[in-house]
C-alpha cells in the first residue's frame, strides 16, 4: 500500500509568491512558492495519487506583514482552502501568546493541529481541551494513518506560550502515545513536528512505532541528485535512519518559507512496515502556474496590508541615525534602537535566577540601510521600517562561546575605515577598541551583560562561557564574514521578522529617543 | 491483529479439483494482494499465484491454465483453485500477505486416489 | 523471471557460532528481499524485510545486509531456538526463493 505524504514546515507567513531567497517577489516571472501556487501542484498530486496527505510541520506564523497585520487568521483560512490533512505547532505559533494561538488558529483550523508533548496545565487546561491533540488518525483511502505530533521543548526560550503550557521531552512524551496508537491497531504512523533535524533523527531512532518523521524548525534541506535551486543538501532525501529496534525510518523536512513541496512516496507491508521511500522535495518556481482563485483570494486579503503601511506605529521625538556614514564607523543611535528591540523581544523570565535569558545584541551596519528623519511629526510607519531593514530577515537566537565573540568583533573592525557592512552595532555589550593595533587584536575591552543577576552589570568577557546572543539570521549563517559565527555556534533558534520586532518595540513604548551612550567606544 | 488461515479439504483425489480459501483478518483486500505458495514434503518453496488489491492477477506460468485466483473483499477471503489434480501436487499449501509480512500456518492437501 | 541462488544448502554449527547465509539474484532487485525462517513444523516467519530491516520481535542477532544482486543474512551468536530452515525470497518481481539454508546442529 503507498501513501504520498506532502510536507511543509518553516513557512512563516510567506503567502505571496517570493524571489529565489525568499524576500519579497520584485520580478514575478522569477519567482517562487506562495499559497497559490502550492495548491495547483498538491492538486496536481491528489489528481494523480490515490492516497495523499499534506502536512505542515510547524512555523506558519510569524515571517512578514501578513502575519503582523492578520496574526494568525491567514493562516487558518489559506490552510484551509488548501486543505491541509494536519498540522504541528511550532514555536512560533506562540508569540502572540496563548490567545494568540487559540482564537485565530486553533478555533478557525479544520484540520488537527498536534502536538504531544505540549501539557496544559490550571485554568487554561479546560480552555484550551480539544483544540489541539496528542494525535490524530486520519482514514487514507481504505487504511488508516496516525500522525502524531511533537514541538520543540525550548518554545517557552523561543516564543511566548505562557505558565500553563508544560513543554515536555519529544521521546517521552511521543512514546506513550504511540504505544496508544498500536493498541488501537493503528499500524502506520507519522510523527510530524516541529524540533528541528537532530530531534527529528533521534525521534525516528528511539521511539519505537514512529514509521516515518516530518520535521521543520532547522530549515534543514534534503535532496537526493542535483539539487534545483540554491539550497546545498544536509543529506539525501528522505535521510535514512536505523531505529534501535533495527528498521529504516525515512526522515524529511522541506527547507522553509514555501519554496518547496516535499514529497515522499511510503510503500507500507500489511504489518505497517515502511518497505520502501523515495521522493524529493519539489522545488515551487514559475513553471508552475499559481491557482486562480487562491490568487484572486490572496489579492484580496492584501488590500488591507497597503492600508497598514502607512498607519503611524509610534513616534520618535529624535533623529534615527541610519546612515552608513554612522552606522557603520560608529555607535549609531539607529542600531542602539534596533537591538533594545531585539532584546525586548526577547524577554523570557523562565528562571528565578536569571533576570532574562539573554542580555546581548549584535548587528551588522550595513544591515541598516535608511535614518528616519523625526522632522515628520515623529511618526513611524511600517513603510518607514522597511527602508531601515528591507531584506526580510529574521532576529534569532544563538548560543556562542566567549572566544567566538571576541573573533565577531575583532572581524568587525578588522578592516576599519572603509564603510563596510560588518561593523557592529550592539546591546548589553560594552567594547572598546583600540585602532592603531593590528587587525584581530583590536579589541582590548569586552564587557558584557550578566543575566544570571537580579541586578544586570557589565562583567569581563570569558572565553570558555556559552552565551546567548540576538542577532540577524545574515550573521547567524555567517553573512558579512562572519564565519566564526556559522562555524562554531553551539545553537541556532530562528526568530521573529526583523521589522515586527521593531515595529512592536515601538508600538510598546509609543514615543522613543535613542541616545548614543557609550557601548562602542 | 494481522492473521492469514488457510481452509480447504486435506485429501483430493487425482483429476479433481483443488480449491483453497485464505481468510484475511487486520488488513484490507482493497490495500494489500495475497500470494499462494506451496511446499511439497522435503522439498523447496514455490510460488503459484498473487492477487492485487486492485483485483488483477498474476500466475506461475508452469501453472497458468490450471490455477485460477479470485477475491471477496468484503468477506475478507481469496479464494484458489487448481484443477487437474495430481499426487505431484502433494504439498503444503500457504497464503501469505503481498510482502510476506505475514503466513497463513499452511494446510497439507495430500493427493491420492 | 528472476532466479535466486542461496549458499549454503546446509551447514552445521554449534551455538554461539557466526553464521552467514548468502543469496545471489539473477539481475537487481533493489533492495526488494526478505529472509524467511522455517521450523520443523512447517511454520513460516519473516526475520527480515527490505534486505535491513528487522521484524517486529525477531532478536538483534539477526542482520540483513546487501545492494544489487547479493545479499547475506547473519546470525551473530546462534541460539538453540535457531536451528531451522532459511529462505531468501525476492519480491522485485513475481515472488521467488532461494533454495534453503538448512542450520543444524553440530
Known amino acids: 500500500w503507498e501513501l504520498t505524504i506532502l510536507h511543509t514546515n518553516d513557512v512563516h507567513s510567506r503567502l505571496e509568491q517570493t524571489s529565489e531567497d525568499s524576500s519579497k517577489c520584485v520580478n514575478a516571472s522569477r519567482c517562487m512558492g506562495g499559497v497559490a501556487r502550492l495548491f495547483t501542484k498538491v492538486q496536481q498530486i491528489r489528481r494523480a495519487e490515490p492516497n495523499v496527505l499534506l502536512l505542515d510541520a510547524g512555523d506558519q506564523y510569524q515571517g512578514t506583514i501578513w502575519f503582523t497585520v492578520y496574526k494568525g487568521a491567514e493562516v487558518a483560512h489559506f490552510m484551509n482552502a488548501l486543505r491541509y490533512d494536519a498540522m504541528a505547532l511550532g514555536n512560533h505559533e506562540f508569540d502572540n501568546g496563548v490567545e494568540g494561538l487559540i482564537e485565530p488558529l486553533l478555533k478557525e483550523a479544520k484540520f488537527p493541529i498536534l502536538s504531544a508533548n505540549i501539557k496544559a496545565k490550571g485554568p487554561l487546561a479546560s480552555q484550551i481541551s480539544g483544540l489541539y491533540l496528542p494525535y490524530k488518525v486520519l482514514p487514507v483511502g481504505d487504511e488508516v494513518v496516525g500522525i502524531v505530533g511533537y514541538t520543540s521543548k525550548e518554545t517557552p526560550f523561543l516564543s511566548n506560550p505562557g505558565t500553563n503550557l508544560v513543554f515536555e521531552d519529544e521521546i517521552t512524551a511521543l512514546q506513550p502515545e504511540v504505544d496508544k496508537l498500536k493498541t488501537l491497531n493503528v499500524n502506520k504512523i507519522i510523527a510530524l513536528g516541529h524540533s528541528g533535524f537532530e530531534m527529528d533523527k533521534l525521534i525516528a531512532q528511539k521511539v519505537r512505532g514512529v514509521d516515518v518523521v516530518v520535521g521543520g524548525h532547522s530549515n534543514t534541506f534534503l535532496y537526493t541528485g542535483n539539487p534545483p535551486s540554491k539550497e546545498v543538501p544536509a543529506g539525501k532525501y528522505p535521510f535514512i535512519v536505523t531505529s534501535d529496534d533495527g528498521r529504516k525510518v525515512p526522515v524529511v523536512q522541506a527547507y522553509a518559507f514555501g519554496k518547496y513541496l516535499g514529497y515522499l512516496k511510503i510503500e507500507f507491508d500489511e504489518r505497517g512496515n515502511v518497505i520502501s521511500s523515495h521522493g524529493n522535495p519539489i522545488l515551487l518556481n514559475s513553471s508552475i502556474p499559481e491557482d486562480p482563485s487562491i490568487k484572486a483570494d490572496i489579492n484580496k486579503w492584501r488590500i488591507k496590508l497597503d492600508n497598514y503601511s502607512t498607519q503611524e506605529l509610534g513616534k520618535t521625538i529624535v533623529y534615527l541615525d541610519g546612515s552608513s556614514q554612522s552606522c557603520r564607523f560608529r555607535e549609531c543611535n539607529m542600531g542602539n534602537l534596533i537591538c533594545d528591540a531585539m532584546i525586548n523581544n526577547n524577554l523570557r523570565h523562565t528562571d528565578e535566577m536569571f533576570w532574562n535569558h539573554v542580555s546581548m545584541c549584535i548587528l551588522n551596519g550595513g544591515g541598516i540601510r535608511s535614518p528616519i528623519d523625526e522632522r515628520n511629526n515623529g511618526t513611524i510607519t511600517w513603510e518607514n521600517l522597511a527602508a531601515v531593514l528591507p531584506f526580510g530577515g529574521t532576529f534569532d537566537l544563538v548560543q556562542l562561546k566567549g572566544s567566538t565573540l571576541k573573533k565577531a568583533f575583532e572581524h568587525s573592525v578588522h578592516r576599519y575605515g572603509q564603510s563596510t557592512g560588518e561593523f557592529l552595532q550592539v546591546g548589553g555589550i560594552h567594547v572598546v577598541y583600540d585602532l592603531s593595533r593590528k587587525p584581530g587584536d583590536r579589541v582590548v575591552k569586552l564587557d558584557v551583560l550578566c543575566t544570571k543577576c537580579r541586578v544586570p552589570s557589565y562583567d569581563p568577557l570569558k572565553m570558555d562561557e556559552v552565551y546567548k546572543v540576538i542577532l540577524p539570521n545574515f550573521l547567524a549563517n555567517g553573512g558579512d564574514g562572519f564565519q566564526m559565527i556559522k562555524d562554531e555556534l553551539l545553537r541556532h533558534d530562528s526568530g521573529d521578522q526583523d521589522i515586527n520586532v521593531v515595529s512592536t518595540y515601538i508600538s510598546k513604548m509609543k514615543v522613543i529617543y535613542p541616545a548614543v551612550e557609550g557601548r562602542i567606544k | 491483529e494481522v492473521t492469514l488461515k488457510e481452509s480447504g479439504p486435506v485429501l483430493v483425489k487425482p483429476t479433481e479439483t483443488l480449491t483453497l480459501t485464505c481468510t484475511v483478518s487486520g488488513f484490507s483486500l482493497s490495500s494489500y494482494g495475497i500470494q499462494w505458495i506451496r511446499q511439497p514434503p522435503g522439498k523447496l518453496l514455490e510460488w503459484l499465484a498473487v492477487?492485487?488489491?486492485?483485483?488483477?492477477?498474476d500466475y506461475n506460468a508452469a501453472f497458468i491454465s490450471r490455477l485460477t485466483i479470485s477475491k471477496d473483499t468484503s468477506k475478507s477471503q481469496v479464494v484458489l483453485t487448481m484443477t487437474n489434480m495430481d499426487p505431484v501436487d502433494t504439498a503444503t499449501y500457504y497464503c501469505?500477505?503481498?510482502?510476506?509480512?505475514?503466513w497463513g500456518q499452511g494446510t497439507l492437501v495430500t493427493v491420492s486416489s | 523471471d528472476i532466479q535466486m541462488t542461496q549458499s549454503p544448502s546446509s551447514l552445521s554449527a554449534s551455538v554461539g557460532d557466526r553464521v552467514t547465509i548468502t543469496c545471489r539474484a539473477s539481475q537487481d532487485i533493489g533492495d526488494r528481499l526478505n529472509w524467511l525462517q522455517q521450523k520443523p513444523g512447517g511454520a513460516i516467519k519473516r526475520l527480515i524485510y527490505?534486505?535491513?530491516s528487522l521484524d517486529s520481535g525477531v532478536p538483534k542477532r539477526f542482520s540483513g545486509s546487501g545492494s544489487g544482486t547479493e545479499y547475506t543474512l547473519t546470525i551473530s551468536s546462534l541460539q538453540p531456538e535457531d536451528f531451522a530452515t532459511y529462505y531468501c525470497?525476492?519480491?522485485?518481481?513475481?515472488?521467488?526463493f532461494g533454495g534453503g539454508t538448512k542450520v543444524e546442529i553440530k
Open positions: 525470497l525476492q519480491y522485485a518481481g513475481s515472488w521467488t
Open positions: 492477487i492485487w488489491s486492485g483485483g488483477s492477477a
Open positions: 527490505a534486505t535491513s
Open positions: 501469505a500477505g503481498q510482502y510476506g509480512s505475514v
